[in-house]
Amino acid sequence: KAMHVAQPAVVLANSRGIASFVCEYASPGKATEVRVTVLRQADSQVTEVCAATYMMGNELTFLDDSICTGTSSGNQVNLTIQGLRAMDTGLYICKVELMYPPPYYMGIGNGTQIYVIDPEPCPDSD
Amino acid sequence: KAMHVAQPAVVLANSRGIASFVCEYASPGKATEVRVTVLRQADSQVTEVCAATYMMGNELTFLDDSICTGTSSGNQVNLTIQGLRAMDTGLYICKVELMYPPPYYMGIGNGTQIYVIDPEPCPDSD
C-alpha cells in the first residue's frame, strides 16, 4: 500500500561534509516497526546509502557500514549523512516502510538534492 | 524589444567563495555594444550585484568596486562572482541589453541559484 513521504527539495552539506534533513511520512495507522532507507540517485544509477529499522519511540539501528545517524520523533525521521565529498552530490531519496503491524505500507519521497563542496586544504603549519 | 537569455539553474560556489556561470543570449541582430547586469533576488528583494558594458570582441568593463569578472565569446558571457559567503546564497539573474545599434533589445534569464557554504576555519598554526 502506498504512503506519502515528504522531504526537503535542497540541502547543502556543510564544509565538513555533513548534511541533515527530515524525512516525514503520513502514517495511515499506528506502526510500531519502521524501516527507513536513503537511496542516492545519480546518472540514473540508484545506490542504497543507509538504512535503519526502529521501533516507535526507540532509537534508530543502522544497517551495515553506515555513514548515517538519525533520530525519530513521531512520524519524522531526522537523518544526518556524514563523510560527503563533492562527488557525492546527488538526489537523496527517502523510502519509508511500515513493517509492523500489518498491513505493510511503503512510501518514497521526491528526493533531496544534496550539494557538496570539497573544502580547500589548509596550509601546512610549519 | 524582448530577447531570450539562458543561464544554468544551479551553481555551487567553491570553497573560496567563487562561482562561475555562463549567460547566453539569442541576439536578434548584430549588436556591437552590450550591457550585462547580474541581479540577486533573495526574500523577494532584488539587488544589483554587478554590471559591465562591452564592445563585441572586446573584454568586459565592470563598474566601480565590482565583485565580478567576465569574458565574452560571441553571444555568451562567462561570469565569475567572487567573495561570496553563505549569506549570499540566492538567485542570481542575468540581464542582457543590446545597446547599439538600434533597435534596443533586453532580455532577462530565469536565474541561477548559487549555493555558498562557508569554509571551516583552519586550525591555528602555533
Epitope: E48, A51, L63, D65, I67, Y100, Y104, M106 | -
Partner: antibody, heavy 119, light 107 residues
C-alpha cells in the same frame, strides 16, 4: 575490478589472538565499509560485524562483543579483524566482504583465511 | 535477531531437474532477502538480491521469489556446475543472519 585479498592461514593456541587482514583494490577504499563473516568447518555462515572505512565506526555481533576489533588503514586500503581469547569454537574460515549498490548484500568476497585453534 | 530457516537441509537431484529451495524468516523482512551459492573451499557467490533480482553474470536458470517471511530459490534446469550449497541471508536489519544452508547433491 573490485578485489579483496586476505592474509594466509593461521594456527593459534587456545587463549591467543589472531589478526586477519583484507587488502582492497579496484575502488575508493573509504567509499565502502568492510564486513566480516566466518564459517566453521561443515557449518553455515555467521556475520561477525562491519567497519565503516571512512571514519572507523564499527558494529559487532553480540556474541563476539568484547573479543573482536575491526580496524582499517586507509593509507594502504586494508581492513583488519582481530579476535582475542581464542577457543576451539573459533576454528573457522574467516571472510571479508564488501557490499555493492545495496546494503547488506555482498557481491565481493575475499578468498577466506583458515584460522585453526588448537588446545 | 531474525532467524532464517532453510529447507530442505540437503537434496539429491539429477541434471535437468527443476530444484526449489525455501527460506523462512522469523519476522517480516519485506523483500530484503539474498541468495548465495558456495562450492567447497570457495567464498560464497551472490546469485539473487532483494528476493528476485538476478546478480550480473548469474545464469537466468536461477530465479528468486517471495516477500514478507517466505522466499524461494528456483533452479529451472539443474546443470553439473550447480551442485553446491545454497544460503539465504536477510539484509533487513542488523545483525545480518544466514540460513543454515541447503546442499544440492547429485542423485
Amino acid at each position: 575490478q573490485v578485489q579483496l585479498v586476505q592474509s594466509g592461514a593461521e594456527v593459534k593456541m587456545s587463549g591467543a589472538s589472531v589478526r586477519v587482514s583484507c587488502k582492497a583494490s579496484g575502488y575508493t577504499f573509504t567509499s565502502y565499509g568492510i564486513s566480516w563473516m566466518r564459517q566453521a568447518p561443515g557449518q553455515g555462515l555467521e556475520w561477525m560485524g562491519w567497519i565503516t572505512a571512512y571514519n572507523g565506526n564499527s558494529n559487532y555481533a553480540q556474541k563476539l562483543q568484547g573479543r573482536v576489533t575491526m580496524t582499517t588503514d586507509t593509507s594502504t586500503g586494508t581492513a583488519y579483524m582481530e579476535l582475542r581469547s581464542l577457543t576451539s569454537d573459533d576454528t573457522a574460515v574467516y571472510y571479508c566482504a564488501r557490499r555493492g549498490d545495496y546494503l547488506g548484500v555482498f557481491p565481493y568476497w575475499g578468498q577466506g583465511t583458515l584460522v585453526t585453534v588448537s588446545s | 535477531d531474525i532467524q532464517m530457516t532453510q529447507s530442505p537441509s540437503s537434496l539429491s537431484a539429477s541434471v535437468g531437474d527443476r530444484v526449489t529451495i525455501t527460506c523462512r524468516a522469523s519476522q517480516s523482512i519485506s523483500s530484503y532477502l539474498n541468495w548465495y551459492q558456495q562450492k567447497p573451499g570457495k567464498a560464497p557467490n551472490l546469485l539473487i538480491y532483494t528476493a528476485s533480482s538476478l546478480q550480473s553474470g548469474v545464469p537466468s536458470r536461477f530465479s528468486g521469489s517471495g516477500s514478507g517471511t517466505d522466499f524461494t530459490l528456483t533452479i529451472s534446469s539443474l546443470q553439473p556446475e550447480d551442485f553446491a550449497t545454497y544460503y539465504c541471508q536477510q539484509s533487513y536489519s542488523s545483525p545480518l543472519t544466514f540460513g543454515g544452508g541447503t546442499k544440492v547433491e547429485i542423485k
